[in-house]
């Protein structure tokens, strides 16, 4: 026993040593050796101990979905997919892991969040970080120059997530992208329209879509005196303006990123501005910005974009925001991000954003990175942040104490007397064959009260009750669970009656 206690203490001490070495950023070899020692100590503790100490949980940043949560998720997905299909998108799927090389150099500062897989004999693999880079790889690999597609799948990020705010290490993304050479800003405007349609349909509250352009950002940095090598890192600082004050952002740019204070001030004059098409017009007149070719192109495109957004009837939902600087390296043109707004405490206050629920932009160079000849396929797309939306919908339903059905069963086949299992089995089979969603209790002689109670709990609207008399008369008693009203229906009419009552089309098409 003393030996076991000593080993346990050694495991604890060795664990602390390993953590300490990692914090001190000790050499990889030393860490590797000390981890190997820790594993050898743990092995000496034997299997019993590890079973005892094993905590049953999902890995950090992941979660299970209960039937209730899945019901919410499927409703959200249904809204999104119907919208994507309404806009004529095809669907694709790609592997959950990619060659590490495919993902390298595409995400800038976020590359450190990519999950690498242990070597499985030759290929260095990483879990996908998003759906956009795999899409670009798919286009290049299949030599496609034209596609409108959606893709709904899980992605993986080695983040330190605040799961309470709907942030995870494994999460779904719902992406819609248009690839191809088209006239400026028409596909971009459609992407913004789709974003607004989905967020409106989901009824998760008021939202605002911030829009900017990478070319405007780059042009602005150039005229403010930021060196090319610092563009991306300064971008990531500016992008924090929705969360922290300008003072904090400026301190980061000057203190941590080595920007001259006067350069930071010049940037501040621009990035604190937001508005509509009038701000675009104003900046087109800006003596310095209008002299920059990149910025001028960006502003011209944004002006055109606002025209199309007005025609689509969504210009009131869009704000031109110079602080929007989406972190990903691959954006080349228009960028956008949708945020939910909290209702202001007092009228006249600025609406307050509570986090991004959708985002996207134009990435004209990404496919070219995979093409041996560097041939570009212009692309624009959007991604719906469904995990955050799931969280919001779940919270809203909890607040309303709304009961969510987790099954779609239309009818329970029940019996009022004993010894009718065979009849119940025959009837439920008939209903299944006719495309009716039906269930029965797995008991030979269930009590009628228990069967009715099951319907109440599961939200099943109808009960088809078989009795000896009904069998003789060739009818089935069809009972509405909520109103408790019962009618006798001829057996041959039962399918049609259930379909009529549950609003299901009369043929399975």
């Amino acid at each position: 026993m003393a030996e076991r206690a000593a080993l346990e203490e050694l495991v604890k001490l060795q664990g602390e040593r390993v953590r300490g070495l990692k914090q001190q950023k000790a050499s990889a070899e030393l860490i590797e050796e000390e981890v190997a020692k820790l594993l050898k100590l743990k092995a000496q503790l034997g299997p019993d101990e590890s079973k005892q100490k094993f905590v049953l949980k999902t890995p950090k940043g992941t979660r299970d979905y209960s039937p209730r949560q899945m019901a919410v998720r499927e409703k959200v997905f249904d809204v999104i997919i119907r919208c994507f299909k309404r806009h004529g998108a095809e669907v694709i799927d790609t592997p959950v892991f990619e060659l590490k090389e495919t993902l390298m150099g595409k995400y800038g500062e976020d590359s450190k969040l990519i999950y690498d897989l242990k070597d499985q004999g030759g290929e260095l693999l990483s879990l996908r970080y998003d759906l956009t880079v795999p899409f670009a790889r798919y286009l290049a690999m299949n030599k496609l120059t034209n596609i409108k597609r959606y893709h709904i799948a899980k992605v993986y990020r080695r983040d330190n997530p605040a799961m309470t705010r709907g942030r995870y290490r494994e999460f779904y993304q719902c992406d819609f992208d248009i690839a191809g050479n088209f006239d400026p800003m028409i596909p971009d405007a459609e992407c913004l329209k789709i974003m607004c349609e989905i967020l409106s349909s989901l009824q998760i509250g008021d939202f605002l879509v911030k829009v900017n352009d990478r070319r405007i950002l780059d042009g602005m940095f150039a005229i403010c005196g930021v060196s090319d090598s610092k563009f991306r890192t300064i971008c990531s600082s500016v992008d924090k303006l929705d969360k922290v004050s300008w003072e904090e952002v400026k301190n980061e740019m000057v203190g941590e990123k080595g920007l001259a204070p006067e350069v930071a001030d010049r940037i501040g004059d621009y990035v604190q501005q937001h508005g509509g098409v009038s701000l675009v017009e104003q900046l087109l007149q800006d003596p310095k910005l209008s002299q920059n070719k990149q910025a001028l192109e960006g502003l011209g495109d944004l002006k055109l974009l606002f025209e199309y957004l007005t025609l689509f009837g969504i210009d009131d939902k869009i704000s031109f925001d110079l602080s929007l600087a989406r972190g990903l390296d691959y954006y080349t043109g228009v960028i956008y991000e949708a945020v939910l707004l909290q209702t202001p405490a007092q009228a006249g206050e600025e609406p307050l954003g509570v986090g991004s629920v959708a985002a996207g932009g134009r990435y004209d160079g990404l496919v070219g990175m995979f093409d041996p000849k560097g041939r570009k396929v212009p692309c624009v797309g959007l991604s719906i942040g469904v995990e955050r939306i799931f969280s919001i919908v779940e919270q809203r339903l909890e607040a309303l104490e709304e009961k969510i059905r987790t099954t779609e069963t239309q009818v329970l086949v029940a019996s009022a007397q004993k010894k009718l299992l065979e009849e119940r089995l025959k009837l439920v089979s008939e209903l299944w064959d006719a495309g009716i969603k039906a269930e029965l209790l797995y008991k030979k002689n269930p009590k009628l009260l228990n069967q009715l109670q099951y319907c109440e709990e599961a939200g099943i609207p109808l009960v088809a009750i078989i009795g000896e008399q009904e069998l003789k008369d060739g009818v089935i008693k069809l009972r509405s669970v909520t109103s408790r009203e019962e009618v006798d229906v001829r057996r041959e009419d039962l399918v049609e009656e259930i379909k009529r009552r549950t609003g299901q089309p009369l043929c399975i098409c």
């Epitope: 000593a6 060795q14 040593r17 050796e33 050898k40 100590l41």
Partner: antibody, heavy 120, light 107 residues
Amino acid sequence: QVQLVESGGGLVKPGGSLRLSCAASGFTFSDYYMSWIRQAPGKGLEWVSYISDKSRYTKYTDKVRGRFTISRDNAKNSLYLQMNSLRAEDTAVYYCARYLYQVIAIADAWGQGTLVTVSS
Amino acid sequence: DIQMTQSPSSVSASVGDRVTITCRASQGISSWLAWFQQKPGKAPKLLIFVASNLESGVPSRFSGSGSGTDFTLTISSLQPEDFATYYCQQAESFPYTFGQGTKLEIK
């Protein structure tokens, strides 16, 4: 019972070489980190070198690095110390020692020691 | 390298006495400390590991305590066979270093 027996010590001239051996028995040798620890006459103890169970990791004190080489043969349950360019200050009793709980750098089993004398 | 300093260098005591030897590390070593006993012409023998764990077969009159930089070996009631030299050793980081030793003599 655990037994460690050193051999190979003796008198050698400065600049000369010696190879110490340690024969292990009574335990699963291939599971354990092993080390050489020395003690100059009338002085304290000094950890010289260690080698991991599968020979992946080895370390030496600054005083001997580049001159001494630790190695092991798990098939023969043997530990070795090849000593080159020997100096007068290397004169000591050399102990072969086993790590505690296979990997903890505390010697829980020692040999009887072998004396190395470096003198002209 | 981590320096280990033992005190006193030598101590005279009688059978039945309680004796305390201290060992100080030049920097924090958590509990990575061991105590050894060595008799003339013999190899050292492990008494205590990770500051306070008694090696099997070692009499319970020996005990160890401390963590960080300051450690103590206590012999609660000296027996004739306990007269020897005692060494502390840090196992925190290589090179693993020993104290200079404390010689326990009969008064």
